[in-house]
């Protein structure tokens, strides 16, 4: 049976085997087409989600679709039901928490009272000014908290207590990529991890350990990527994996936070990378133990210079490394998180590509997660 499962796929009605390599090849080889059912699916970027959260204390902003203007949500008459609606609009199914935070002197956006219409937040038309002088600070999910804070050093062995959102994404029990837990159902990773194998069956996720071989595997229900853009072949290197069964969170299995829409990280901002990838360029061997390293944001202009990536780094990507080189992600780290710590840990980047590993003028290039929040929310909403 193990041999059969490894090399063949069973079609139903009539029952017969086809070679596994015919799965997800774009051809209907089973009469009912089930060989093309459980495949990596593409999902378009979709419409703008009309709610978002700002890095200013996770305050809620709502889009007025008539004018295209964003407004800050006033705390006046804000309720648990409105909080749930806001989070559902972003695709969250968990119970949110919210509180009032004082409007600061530098409040830029206008402030309006919020109501609900057809399960979407709207500005209340007939409202007065914001009497409470407070905004809504909203958290859709408890995320980004770990049991242990990493020390700031070069490269060192990591503990799952520091990075409880880190997962190993495996095909046929072999580690292929890293990934990050975003909520009980969803793991974030890179689209290029699935280029070779587009059938969902043999992909598994392992969570809750810093050792590669030692933890149980979780079945995957769906793998979703963005439609490929031939104009920018390296863009859109992002994927979401939906787990068959929701994770139970613990000290070693927890979600990381998505970044805020306005999370603009300036050059030299300290960040962290983790993974089981190669420890040497062309080193030929994965690390058995999770490794961590501190890096920093590298200016996109510098990253696109003639002696570096020569304009290949788009606005939907970001560079990180250390100016003198030597600390970088490498093969096998792909899909893992580039992380920023404010009050919580946020996944600001996804390990994507680069020339070599650790070169001084060619740092790691990462998918900029904030550029894809809309896509993530739309995928989640479609799967609620």
């Amino acid at each position: 049976k193990v041999i059969l499962d490894k090399y063949y796929f069973l079609c139903g009605q009539p029952l017969h085997f086809i070679p596994r390599k015919q799965l997800c090849d774009g051809e209907l080889d089973c009469p009912l087409g089930e060989d093309e059912e459980h495949c990596v699916k593409s999902f378009p970027e979709g419409p703008a989600v009309a709610v978002r959260l700002s890095k200013d204390r996770s305050t809620l902003q709502v889009l007025d679709s008539a004018t295209g203007n964003w407004f800050s949500a006033c705390f006046d008459n804000f309720t648990e039901a409105l909080a749930e609606t806001a989070c559902r609009q972003m695709g969250y199914s968990s119970k949110p928490t919210f509180r009032a935070v004082e409007i600061g002197p530098d409040q830029d956006l206008d402030v309006v009272e919020i109501t609900e219409n057809s399960q979407e937040l709207r500005m209340r038309n007939s409202s007065g000014p914001c009497l409470s002088g407070s905004l809504v600070s909203l958290h859709c999910l408890a995320c980004g908290k770990s049991l242990k804070t990493p020390r700031v050093v070069g490269v060192e062995e990591a503990s799952v207590d520091s990075w409880p959102w880190q997962v190993s994404i495996q095909y046929d029990k072999q580690h292929v990529c890293g990934g990050s837990i975003l909520d009980p159902h969803w793991v974030l990773t890179a689209a290029h991890c699935f280029r070779k194998h587009t059938d969902v069956f043999n992909w598994k996720v392992r969570a809750g350990s810093d050792k590669l071989g030692s933890f149980p595997s979780l079945a995957v229900a769906k793998i979703i990527i963005i439609e490929f853009n031939p104009m920018y072949p390296k863009d859109n290197d992002i994927a979401l994996m939906k787990l068959q069964f929701p994770l139970t969170f613990s000290g070693t299995v927890r979600p990381i936070c998505l970044p805020f829409f306005d999370e603009e990280l300036t050059p030299a901002t300290p960040l962290w990378i983790i993974g089981w990838g190669f420890t040497k360029q062309n080193g030929g061997k994965m690390s058995d133990i999770l490794l961590q390293a501190s890096v920093q944001v590298i200016d996109s202009t510098r990253c696109n210079a003639d002696d570096a990536y020569q304009g290949e780094v788009t606005e939907k990507m970001m560079c990180a490394g250390i100016p003198e080189g030597g600390v970088d992600t490498c093969q096998g780290d792909s899909g893992g998180p580039l992380m920023y710590q404010s009050d919580q840990w946020h996944v600001v980047g996804i390990v994507s590509w680069g020339y070599g590993c650790g070169g001084p003028s060619t740092p790691g290039v990462y998918t900029k997660v904030s550029a894809y929040l809309n896509w993530i929310y739309n995928v989640w909403k479609a799967e609620l």
Partner: antibody, heavy 121, light 107 residues
Framework: QVQLVQSGAEVKKPGASVKVSCKAS????????MHWVRQAPGQGLEWMGW????????NFAQKFQGRVTMTRDTSTSTVYMELSSLRSEDTAVYYC??????????????WGQGTLVTVSS | DIQMTQSPSSLSASVGDRVTITCRAS??????LAWYQQKPGKAPKLLIY???SLQSGVPSRFSGSGSGTDFTLTISSLQPEDFATYYC?????????FGGGTKVEIK
Amino acid sequence: QVQLVQSGAEVKKPGASVKVSCKASGYTFTRYYMHWVRQAPGQGLEWMGWINPNSGVTNFAQKFQGRVTMTRDTSTSTVYMELSSLRSEDTAVYYCARVRIGWLQSPPLYWGQGTLVTVSS
Amino acid sequence: DIQMTQSPSSLSASVGDRVTITCRASQSINTWLAWYQQKPGKAPKLLIYAASSLQSGVPSRFSGSGSGTDFTLTISSLQPEDFATYYCQQAISFPLTFGGGTKVEIK
């Protein structure tokens, strides 16, 4: 675009009252506090008070308590400022000014053209 | 009430000069400070809010800084249209209070 249009210049005798109007357009009238600020000839700016056009609630500087009334008419999107027991030192240009965004401590951004009130016997 | 003291009360400068106006509050106002420009016979115009945030549409040669009790308005390169009177205003508590004004005149 936001516009605040004030009533014309007035000449009043000491002891009389004056009522200045400020008609708003180009935005949702009830959503933004309106301040009144005055400026005596050759002098600086002096805050008088505010009105919430949605509820009609007002707040005045201590100096004007008992002499000033601020009202609004939501049907015409107009706010009014009435100052009674006028004295010569009330001679000034009176401005209505809408806050920048919809909460109280936001600075006045949109200003009316000003109404000159002259108090003279 | 919070007193706002501006200095100087007037200054003479030439086109292209860098001009600095200061404003001091009688107690800490965090960054609850706005700056206005007023030309003769006209209403004041908001330039800066929150001590350093440039109001939309205001030229970038205007900048504000400071926090607590001491604040500065800087015009990096004075233009002919900048000759006017400038006022600071605190917004941390009522009554709102304005500085006495600084008149910027042509040298």
